[in-house]
Interface confidence: low
């Protein structure tokens, strides 16, 4: 339906407060080297003339689009040019140009200093003080971060980091209480960050139709007693939404996502018997809730797959007469009998299925050419299942940071060219699947594991299409959404690396690391972990763990030192040339 | 590889009892929904009762409702069938599938009732 004023429609059923978090977090996203106060400015100038729009539609401008009125303000900045360079030729573009030359601009690691959390009662004060301001900082520093974020979980967000200090401020114990909560908030808002970069990056990089695809099959398996109908009338409504926060349009994704929520509420009894505590919480918690909740268990009366998708003699009938909607069905069918596959797993066997149907449909006997196409299946589900056991026993073996270590080594030698930040934080996600997803009973395991293996990979696959510098990424990144972890697993050492130059700065080390939190000592270890495997990529296991052995104990050694500068300066001297030696350098 | 082995069956008097068991194994058990199946001589399979992954939601045929109950232990990886109340036409080898498959994976169990 058709509305005068496309702003005051959004203004009235969002509500102020809404509205105004959410314009601020599409602006943030944009500009992410604005400062805060700038960006309240314009909040609150857009927010007046909603307002204006809302009291008449029929006022000046109020019949402008969304892209056109935000790209109009973001386009006053003053030091657009100076900050952010080419991005201010965006402005001289119409819409809808102007907004995809805006989206081709956000930045995955923009360069921001990384957040300092203060101290509890500096943090507290500031709370008391300006809840509003302090909230609305919250929104900007996450969402200029994290330029894809999803715009109305991070509502959902803001609103547990409220009550986080709600609480807590005034307990007896205020950090005891508050740092958990932050910790959790902050885990898991970086988790949420991965997670819808991958869909958002499923959609512009390979379309609606692989959004599609990925979506039947999890609600599928989400929802296994709906009715293929259903389930796709869900796909079409939630792919709506995705497109729409991945495209910058944060006021209609938030609305048509309370929608979809309230559809699915209304009619859980044909969709989902998990759904009941949800439906009874608050709109943000309960879209949160529908997102995240646990399949549904499988009907009792599921017939066998082959009857319609191999014995039958009408599949290539059938499949000639609605491609996509055949090939729905069956990931539907699939999907809901097997909540043990990851969704890459599934969809991998749906385009096997197709690839079999298009050379089979058009041959001689074609109900002979596909009799054997679920034995093709076979070697596609033992792979991960293989895989998974493998890595598992190896995590088990050698807990979390070892773990780490191993992956370090394995993705440094396979795509040595990467930069040494990038390869320390992606091995060190894909190291956290074993605590994630190890504890887990086999029927959980492969979903777990694969498809958050998946969302880590596309974080190293968006950072390097920022500075494409392996050929092997770009290709395992490009070729095929579903088969980026088999791509990345096959590989092998990068044979045509040329070893970086030794440099001994790069394992030089100060007193400071002894402060650093066990976290941060980590890093800094596994980055000269990434570094000697640079200089040395025929170095075996042995020999890296004898280093950093030694490296762990050189660090410890200094840092119960009285003088540790001056330890670390001679010994670490000590240690480079014990190194050198070790590996050969 | 999966494997679906039954137990339980045997000759038995009409009005009697018999427990039949299935153990599976080489899949994730407690993922799937089972069947019990029957075959009777010289007769097509035919679907006699289901249960959900979770064993929440049970289905039976007609013929024998009210009489069998379906149940699971997905700790023990285990379907079971309790039958009472039997009659001579409940003469039929009993298996176990997954889903609601009527098509046979296994060697099945002989349930004969007869006075």
């Known amino acids: 339906d058709a509305h005068k004023s496309e702003v005051a429609h959004r203004f009235k059923d969002l509500g102020e407060e809404n509205f105004k978090a959410l314009v601020l977090i599409a602006f943030a996203q944009y500009l992410q080297q604005c400062p805060f106060e700038d960006h309240v400015k314009l909040v609150n100038e857009v927010t007046e003339f909603a307002k204006t729009c809302v009291a008449d539609e029929s006022a000046e401008n109020c019949d402008k689009s969304l892209h056109t009125l935000f790209g109009d303000k973001l386009c006053t900045v003053a030091t657009l040019r100076e900050t952010y360079g080419e991005m201010a030729d965006c402005c001289a573009k119409q819409e809808p140009e102007r907004n995809e030359c805006f989206l081709q601009h956000k930045d995955d690691n923009p360069n921001l200093p990384r957040l300092v959390r203060p101290e509890v009662d500096v943090m507290c004060t500031a709370f008391h003080d300006n809840e509003e301001t302090f909230l609305k900082k919250y929104l900007y520093e996450i969402a200029r971060r994290h330029p894809y974020f999803y715009a109305p979980e991070l509502l959902f967000f803001a609103k547990r980091y409220k009550a986080a200090f709600t609480e807590c401020c005034q307990a007896a114990d205020k950090a005891a209480c508050l740092l958990p909560k932050l910790d959790e908030l902050r885990d898991e808002g970086k988790a949420s960050s991965a997670k819808q970069r991958l869909k958002c990056a499923s959609l512009q990089k390979f379309g609606e139709r692989a959004f599609k695809a990925w979506a039947v099959a999890r609600l599928s398996q989400r929802f296994p007693k709906a009715e293929f109908a259903e389930v796709s009338k869900l796909v079409t409504d939630l792919t709506k939404v995705h497109t729409e926060c991945c495209h910058g349009d944060l006021l209609e994704c938030a609305d048509d996502r309370a929608d979809l929520a309230k559809y699915i509420c209304e009619n859980q009894d044909s969709i989902s018997s998990k759904l009941k505590e949800c439906c009874e919480k608050p709109l943000l918690e309960k879209s949160h809730c529908i997102a995240e909740v646990e399949n549904d268990e499988m009907p009792a009366d599921l017939p066998s797959l082959a009857a319609d998708f191999v014995e039958s003699k009408d599949v290539c009938k059938n499949y000639a007469e609605a491609k996509d909607v055949f090939l729905g069905m069956f990931l539907y069918e699939y999907a809901r009998r097997h909540p043990d596959y990851s969704v890459v797993l599934l969809l991998r066997l749906a385009k096997t299925y197709e690839t079999t149907l298009e050379k089979c449909c058009a041959a001689a006997d074609p109900h002979e050419c596909y009799a054997k196409v679920f034995d093709e299946f076979k070697p596609l589900v033992e792979e991960p299942q293989n895989l998974i056991k493998q890595n598992c026993e190896l995590f088990e073996q050698l807990g979390e940071y070892k773990f780490q270590n191993a992956l370090l080594v394995r993705y440094t030698k396979k795509v040595p060219q990467v930069s040494t930040p990038t390869l320390v934080e992606v091995s060190r996600n894909l190291g956290k699947v074993g605590s994630k997803c190890c504890k887990h009973p086999e029927a959980k395991r492969m979903p777990c594991a694969e498809d958050y293996l998946s969302v880590v990979l596309n974080q190293l696959c968006v950072l390097h299409e920022k500075t494409p510098v392996s050929d092997r990424v770009t290709k395992c990144c490009t070729e095929s959404l579903v088969n980026r972890r088999p791509c990345f697993s096959a590989l092998e050492v990068d044979e045509t690396y040329v070893p970086k130059e030794f440099n001994a700065e790069t394992f030089t080390f100060h007193a400071d690391i002894c402060t650093l939190s066990e976290k941060e000592r980590q890093i800094k270890k596994q980055t000269a972990l990434v570094e000697l495997v640079k200089h040395k990529p025929k170095a075996t296991k042995e020999q890296l763990k004898a280093v950093m052995d030694d490296f762990a104990a050189f660090v410890e050694k200094c840092c119960k030192a009285d003088d540790k500068e001056t330890c670390f300066a001679e010994e670490g001297k000590k240690l480079v040339a014990a190194s050198q030696a070790a590996l050969g350098l | 590889e999966v494997q679906l082995v039954e137990s339980g069956g045997g000759l038995v008097q009409p009005g009697g009892s018999l427990r039949l068991s299935c153990a599976a194994s080489?899949?994730?058990?407690?993922?799937?929904?089972m069947s019990w199946v029957r075959q009777a001589p010289g007769k097509g399979p035919e679907w006699v009762s289901a249960?959900?992954?979770?064993?929440?939601?049970?289905r039976y045929a007609e013929s024998v409702k009210g009489r069998f109950t379906i149940s699971r232990d997905n700790a023990k990886k285990t379907l079971y069938l309790q039958m009472n109340s039997l009659k001579p036409e409940d003469t039929a080898v009993y298996y176990c599938?997954?889903?609601?498959?009527?098509?046979?994976g296994s060697q099945g169990t002989q349930v004969t009732v007869s006075s």
């Open positions: 080489g899949f994730t058990f407690g993922s799937f929904g």
């Open positions: 249960i959900d992954s979770g064993g929440a939601d049970t």
């Open positions: 599938t997954i889903g609601r498959s009527t098509s046979r």
